[in-house]
Amino acid sequence: FERTRSLQDPCSNCPAGTFCDNNRNQICSPCPPNSFSSAGGQRTCDICRQCKGVFRTRKECSSTSNAECDCTPGFHCLGAGCSMCEQDCKQGQELTKKGCKDCCFGTFNDQKRGICRPWTNCSLDGKSVLVNGTKERDVVCGPSPADLSPGASSVTPPAPAREPGHSPQ
């Protein structure tokens, strides 16, 4: 191992993956197992993050970089750097203190995470419900009720065929 020669701070020459060992006359010593230093000149190495239980290892710890975790299947990451794991639910459910619970009538969730959201109120946009909502899916809004009055067609007529060489109007 290299004995540092810097006149200012003998530790400044210690590279990432080592620490400046005061117990050994400020020699650069490699980080012990399960620890790392990501920058040079450090006087200690940091303990590697352990990915266990709800976490699983995405990237192993090395002498120069910390381990990275994601979540064990059945859970998903929350927070910066996957600092927490939260339970998945099925579509049509939301997570509560009591675990996964079905969405109440009039609400839906089309994902494995997040909360149940109210169905779209089609009438606010002057439209009618074309497809009813479910616990897993929002309603589909269609034409306004006036457009569906007797004699009115709910099907959009086809656009007139264009002759070759003519640009659309």
Partner: nanobody, 123 residues
């Protein structure tokens, strides 16, 4: 260093009982919701039960309701899971997990868990 260590697992016959323990250290145990989660062989992780900081609220997944009881002793920094009327489908590795800051308010994420203890229910 924050640490959770589970113990108490083992082999038990169907209908039998086990009591799991989780020893917490490195943080103020009484300030956190705590959880038990489990992973059956070849399956995803499943939440089992949780308990509020002071033990005043307890919740369970439907499949263990009435058979399992979660409890805590804040003076001893310990979490427990009393498992009665065990079934083959309870066979799993059981993990103790801490609810992260804001658990129960803005999220239900867990930020620390232990190595797990194995429960095998078989005749």
């Amino acid at each position: 260093q924050v640490q959770l260590v589970e113990s108490g697992g083992g082999l038990v016959q169907p209908g039998g009982s086990l009591r799991l323990s989780c020893a917490a250290s490195g943080f103020t145990f009484s300030n956190y919701w705590m959880n038990w989660v489990r992973q059956a062989p070849g399956k995803g992780l499943e939440w089992v039960a949780n308990i509020k900081e002071d033990g005043s609220e307890k919740y369970y997944v439907d499949s263990v309701e009435g058979r399992f009881t979660i409890s805590r002793d804040n003076a001893r920094n310990s979490l427990y899971l009393q498992m009665n009327s065990l079934r083959a489908e309870d066979t799993a590795v059981y993990y103790c997990a801490r609810g992260g800051e804001g658990y129960g308010d803005s999220h239900y994420g867990m930020d620390v868990s232990g190595q797990g203890t194995t429960v095998t229910v078989s005749s």
